[in-house]
């Protein structure tokens, strides 16, 4: 039985050219986390494997940094980064838990509330 829940930063906004932390937290399960995948729509951004550590997809190496923790930091944001992001927790024996975050990248003058949603 899958008892776990994923807590995410939810819907967030950030300024163009800035950076943002995407964060998910798995709780309410003692299942072993074997790997966490970060995906944007159908594109793999990064993998954190329990044994092998982090792997950042080559096409995102310049703008994606691992952490903090199992989170992901996106840098040098562009308007094209707007969209859905998914954290996918692969666990044993439960299976897969998925969290969703919607990021909106705004022109500097518009993103006045974005900071409220960022995790320090």
């Amino acid at each position: 039985m899958m008892t776990g829940t994923i807590e995410t930063t939810g819907n967030i906004s950030a300024e163009k050219g800035g950076s943002i932390i995407l964060q998910c937290h798995l709780s309410s399960t003692t299942a072993q986390v074997t790997q966490v995948n970060w995906e944007q729509q159908d594109q793999l951004l990064a993998i954190c494997n329990a044994d092998l550590g982090w792997h950042i997809s080559p096409s995102f190496k310049d703008r994606v940094a691992p952490g903090p923790g199992l989170g992901l930091t996106l840098q040098s944001l562009t308007v094209n980064d707007t969209g859905e992001y998914f954290c996918i927790y692969h666990t044993y024996p439960d299976g897969t838990y998925t969290g969703r975050i919607f990021l909106e990248v705004l022109e500097s003058s518009v993103a006045e509330h974005g900071a409220r949603f960022q995790i320090p």
Epitope: M1, T3, E7, H25, L26, S27, S28, T29, T30, A31, Q32, V33, C48, A50, D51, G69, L70
Partner: antibody
Framework: QVQLKQSGPGLVQPSQSLSITCTVS????????VHWVRQSPGKGLEWLGV???????DYNAAFISRLSISKDNSKSQVFFKMNSLQTNDTAIYYC??????????WGAGTTVTVSS | QIVLTQSPAIMSASLGERVTMTCTAS???????LHWYQQKPGSSPKLWIY???NLASGVPARFSGSGSGTSYSLTISSMEAEDAATYYC?????????FGAGTKLELK
């Protein structure tokens, strides 16, 4: 203020069962899991099991045959029962709240001595 | 199960001294799921450092934590009398959840 208050007997006869109640305040049992951990001089800190916000449980395989954890959300109480106690079950038993896979607040503990 | 080995078992430090204790896991632990608790005699354990390096509320900034994989450590930059206690590492990576045997830190 988040608190977990424990009540239960201090002395248990060998082969008898142990029942401890953990009454929580400052948060709802429908939102957080509560774990049970014991501490003895011989074995240190041992995780025993957990009851999740939805009411399902996970147990340490070493104790699954004689351990039961339940709760009453309306009374903010978690109930711990362990059967067939032996002298090596003598320990301090703690309940603790889980947040993001760590224990942020612990009860004061219930000291249990198994002796005839 | 994951065995956590803490060293040293007992150590003493003078006021102002830098203190480091280690926790070695028998298999890899994701750093987000390695935590430290402080316990003083007659009291229950208190969350001290969570997810390897984050200080719990009220913990002095002289404490820090680091590590990854199978090797973790807790450091006190300058020992104070109130730091005398036993420190336990704890993994929530895999069931059964386990704790180290503790490092007892005494004031010299």
């Amino acid at each position: 203020q988040v608190q977990l208050k424990q009540s239960g007997p201090g002395l248990v006869q060998p082969s008898q069962s142990l029942s401890i109640t953990c009454t929580v305040s400052g948060f709802s049992l429908t939102s957080y899991g509560v774990h049970w951990v014991r501490q003895s001089p011989g074995k240190g800190l041992e995780w025993l099991g957990v009851i999740w916000s939805g009411g399902s449980t996970d147990y340490n395989a070493a104790f699954i045959s004689r351990l039961s954890i339940s709760k009453d959300n309306s009374k903010s109480q978690v109930f711990f029962k362990m059967n067939s106690l032996q002298t090596n079950d003598t320990a301090i038993y703690y309940c603790a709240r889980e947040v993001r896979r760590y224990f942020d607040v612990w009860g004061a503990g219930t000291t249990v001595t198994v002796s005839s | 199960q994951i065995v956590l080995t803490q060293s040293p078992a007992i150590m003493s430090a003078s006021l102002g001294e830098r203190v480091t204790m280690t926790c070695t896991a028998s298999s890899s632990v994701i750093s987000s799921y390695l935590h430290w608790y402080q316990q003083k005699p007659g009291s229950s354990p208190k969350l001290w450092i969570y997810s390897t390096s984050n200080l719990a509320s009220g913990v002095p900034a002289r404490f820090s934590g680091s590590g990854s994989g199978t090797s973790y450590s807790l450091t006190i930059s300058s020992m104070e009398a109130e730091d005398a206690a036993t420190y336990y590492c704890h993994q929530y990576h895999r069931s059964p959840l386990t704790f180290g045997a503790g490092t007892k830190l005494e004031l010299k």
